[in-house]
């Protein structure tokens, strides 16, 4: 014969536990029903009556099957440096995460307690570790042969363009400026006519003559005095 299915409330067999989504009520000494997420226990069970559940009120929630007398309060509204990535509902708490360009300097169980702006690397310095949701940017000086002319939390140092003839050599905060050695080819109307560099950047699609010898500039350039360690700006 199949075992009889017990309906809550029921007294458990000695040594056994209550089933899934049930809890043992110490007062009634019975296995009773839990309340579903979004509800709480309005009336606890007795030996003869099961738990009475009620919906959570506005701005309160329960995320799990439970038998709590009151729902939990949702967290406070997200601050101006945060975005609400999960709204407060009867079944889940509000989650605030840092808005783009910020990172979480102090986290809490879910979401973030304190956001801070991502560090910006000043000219001559590039991003050596991109920021994440929970970690700040790390800036490092641009290596010889590379530059960054921006104040940015995302820009890495980029190689100087290679010129047939250099007008102004590049440095850590400025790209090399090339001298135009041939007439600039025709461009679309209104286009700015700039000297054509022999670029190290592959997104420059024009065919470029290659210098007969192109050793790595990082091997050629002497290391100057080290720039100051603070390669970042707080703004």
């Amino acid at each position: 014969l199949p075992a009889q299915v017990a309906f809550t409330p029921y007294a458990p067999e000695p040594g056994s536990t209550c089933r899934l989504r049930e809890y043992y009520d110490q007062t009634a000494q019975m296995c009773c029903s839990k309340c579903s997420p979004g509800q709480h226990a309005k009336v606890f069970c007795t030996k003869t009556s099961d738990t009475v559940c009620d919906s959570c009120e506005d701005s309160t929630y329960t995320q799990l099957w439970n038998w709590v007398p009151e729902c939990l309060s949702c967290g406070s509204r997200c601050s101006s440096d945060q975005v609400e990535t999960q709204a407060c509902t009867r079944e889940q708490n509000r989650i605030c995460t840092c808005r783009p360009g910020w990172y979480c300097a102090l986290s809490k169980q879910e979401g973030c307690r304190l956001c801070a702006p991502l560090r910006k690397c000043r000219p001559g310095f590039g991003v050596a570790r991109p920021g994440t949701e929970t970690s700040d940017v790390v800036c490092k000086p641009c290596a010889p042969g590379t530059f960054s002319n921006t104040t940015s939390s995302t820009d890495i140092c980029r190689p100087h363009q290679i010129c047939n003839v250099v007008a102004i050599p590049g440095n850590a905060s400025m790209d090399a400026v090339c001298t135009s050695t041939s007439p600039t080819r025709s461009m679309a109307p209104g286009a700015v006519h700039l000297p054509q560099p022999v670029s190290t950047r592959s997104q420059h699609t024009q065919p470029t003559p290659e210098p007969s010898t192109a050793p790595s500039t990082s091997f050629l350039l002497p290391m100057g005095p080290s720039p100051p360690a603070e390669g970042s700006t707080g703004d």
Partner: antibody, heavy 118, light 109 residues
């Protein structure tokens, strides 16, 4: 002249720990991350981790997490990579490098061969 | 940890064009992976060729170019030279660590 000079070859027993050094010269060690990369015989490159000598912060590959410690001593311009609980598959050449993927400051040590054998 | 996959080997004729690719197990490769390409010639030091997906490192010949192609990082060699025969590794950045691909052995034949 930029140089990264690594310590000599090591032979270790399984379970032992090895510590390799990488002495840098020709640049300010605080200006660039120092990376460690593994190349097992006949295999490709495996990134182990990197240290920011300026503040000692480290990042490690998941595969080596818990077994590897990368440090840098700015007073001697030396970076170190310590790998513990060695096993036979750790037999490889280990390189220190300023290659960073972000900086184009591309220098490599000569490599240190570590042989793990009982 | 993510797995980065490359073609184990490719062959190109001298003067020909070949594209090496680099796939990520976590989804399409984006500029946030800062794709890098590193060259290893037998008995020589490693050499970074491409960084930031498509920037050639200083001194790298213009015949090497980097791009994103169909959700993968790509290294294109146009006008291959015998001296380009080498092992090529791609490396992708994942939030706080680099992962190298298995490498592509390029033969110029």
């Amino acid at each position: 002249e930029v140089q990264l000079v690594q310590s000599g070859a090591e032979v270790k027993k399984p379970g032992a720990t090895v510590k390799i050094s990488c002495k840098v010269s020709g640049f300010n060690i605080k200006d660039f991350y120092i990376h460690w990369v593994q190349q097992a015989p006949g295999k490709g490159l495996e990134w182990i981790g990197r240290v920011d000598p300026e503040d000692g912060n480290t990042e490690y590959a998941e595969k080596f997490q818990g077994r590897v410690t990368i440090t840098a001593d700015t007073s001697t311009d030396t970076a170190y990579m310590e790998l513990s609980s060695l096993r036979s598959e750790d037999t490889a050449v280990y390189y220190c490098s300023t290659w960073d993927g972000f900086s184009y400051f591309d220098y490599w040590g000569q490599g240190t061969t570590v042989t793990v054998s009982s | 940890q993510a797995v980065v996959t490359q073609e184990p080997s490719l062959t190109v004729s001298p003067g020909g064009t070949v594209t090496l690719t680099c796939r990520s197990s976590t989804g399409p490769v984006t500029t946030n992976n800062y794709a890098n390409w590193v060259q290893q010639k037998p008995g020589q030091a490693f050499r970074g060729l491409i960084g930031g997906t498509n920037d050639r490192a200083p001194g790298v010949p213009a015949r090497f170019s980097g791009s994103l192609l169909g959700g993968k990082a790509a290294l294109t060699l146009s006008g291959a030279q015998p001296e380009d025969e080498a092992e090529y590794y791609c490396a992708l950045w994942y939030r706080n660590h680099w992962v190298f691909g298995g490498g592509t052995k390029l033969t110029v034949l």
